[in-house]
């Protein structure tokens, strides 16, 4: 038997993936555990093997289908269970009735690219990945730019309150190396959270023209 507190948190990427993390304050080092997903109104169910991510937490991804297929809707409720092997039996360690579109975390934006760069400004675009057509344009973005000598945590957040997959960064320093990241969040969902940050895009502003006042 396992004592201690347990936390079981899952997010839906809005298409065909539910990612789960299970934390348990009591050692279960050599036990095999899995997450089982059982939708209330679908003919399929799905299982994934929980793998350790730290001393007391495990994670896994429920792959529900092809990455861009709409496997769940706003009406679905999915019973999610953590099952751990005890001898020849499986024991239910945690359970939740999961409303996918109340618990969203989209995939990080992809395909970041510099559209145009000048001495003091840079236009950057990106794409969203595996996001449901349900959202229409009702998404928001946060972006940040890493300046020399600073950390990502120090970078001010720029908020885009609509589905705008580009940004024009202003007041940059000429001939300077920067990095840029963006993340996305739907407006829908009580427990929805920001996507992971995108992979950083490195870019360099153009040098100031010699002999010109910049």
């Amino acid at each position: 038997a396992v004592n201690g507190t347990s936390q079981f948190t899952c997010f839906y990427n809005s298409r065909a993936n539910i990612s789960c993390v299970w934390s348990q304050d009591g050692a279960l080092q050599d036990t095999s555990c899995q997450v089982h997903a059982w939708p209330d109104r679908r003919r399929w169910n799905q299982t994934c093997e929980l793998l350790p991510v730290s001393q007391a937490s495990w994670a896994c991804n429920l792959i529900l289908g092809a990455p861009d297929s709409q496997k769940l809707t706003t009406v679905d409720i999915v019973t999610l269970r953590v099952l751990c092997r005890e001898g020849v039996r499986w024991r239910v360690m945690a359970i939740q009735d999961f409303k996918p579109f109340e618990n969203l975390r989209l995939m990080a934006p992809i395909s970041l690219q510099v559209v145009h760069v000048e001495t003091h400004r840079c236009n950057i675009s990106w794409e969203i990945s595996q996001a449901s057509h349900y959202f229409e344009r009702h998404l928001e973005f946060e972006a940040r730019t890493l300046s020399p000598g600073h950390t990502w945590e120090e970078a001010p957040l720029l908020t885009l309150k609509q589905k705008q997959e580009w940004i024009c960064l202003e007041t940059l320093t000429p001939d300077t190396q920067y990095e840029f990241q963006v993340r996305v969040k739907p407006l829908q969902g009580e427990f929805t959270t920001w996507s992971p940050w995108s992979q950083p895009l490195a870019f360099r502003t153009k040098p100031a023209a010699l002999g010109k006042d910049t």
Epitope: Q70, T73, T74, F101, F135, E136, H138, L187, E190
Partner: antibody
Framework: EVQLVQSGAEVKKPGATVKISCKVS????????IHWVQQAPGKGLEWMGW????????EYAPGFQDRVTITADTSTDTAYMELSSLRSEDTAVYYC??????????WGQGTTVTVSS | EIVMTQSPATLSVSPGERATLSCRAS??????LHWYQQKPGQAPRLLII???QSISGIPARFSGSRSGTEFTLTISSLQSEDFAVYFC?????????FGQGTKLEIK
Amino acid sequence: EVQLVQSGAEVKKPGATVKISCKVSGFNFKESLIHWVQQAPGKGLEWMGWIDNEAGETEYAPGFQDRVTITADTSTDTAYMELSSLRSEDTAVYYCARGGPWFLSYWGQGTTVTVSS
Amino acid sequence: EIVMTQSPATLSVSPGERATLSCRASQIISNNLHWYQQKPGQAPRLLIIYGLQSISGIPARFSGSRSGTEFTLTISSLQSEDFAVYFCQQSNNFPYTFGQGTKLEIK
């Protein structure tokens, strides 16, 4: 410009079936949800159901699911709502609308259906 | 089924004044509440989503707020074109349901 243009007014006898069309333009019909909403006199708005053209799925409100069928023809960008076994209380304006599942962003002009013997 | 109750049924306000319309849900619906405006002979028009997010193209005088299961639509300074019927709609539980409407009329 997003547009949803519905077919004209209908007069039907009790027990008959009505089929209303909703021709859309200005957006990608194949990646959209089309909803249908009833507005009966003195009864307010009632959501009837939707069709998800990308997933090929329909959802119906429990109060309508025995009598309503929502379909779509993606070759003509047209959605249809068929209501059977009509009764006098089905006399109403019926709207098609585009939206995500949660709210209705753009609406058709409405189709009046009168059920009378 | 979640019941949405709007109050008052009719609200009489003078142009230029503030109007406050209320919508209460019979159970907790988080922020899954949306507001529509309907003028006579026209289809409803979406104004506000998720309790307080304005739709682009909607004048800034329209705003929404939430306190528990009670939602409020405020029109800060009424214009002649704002006199209409206003509906709320919940999308927390299936089937989605509308309030019965508040008629905003000229005082």
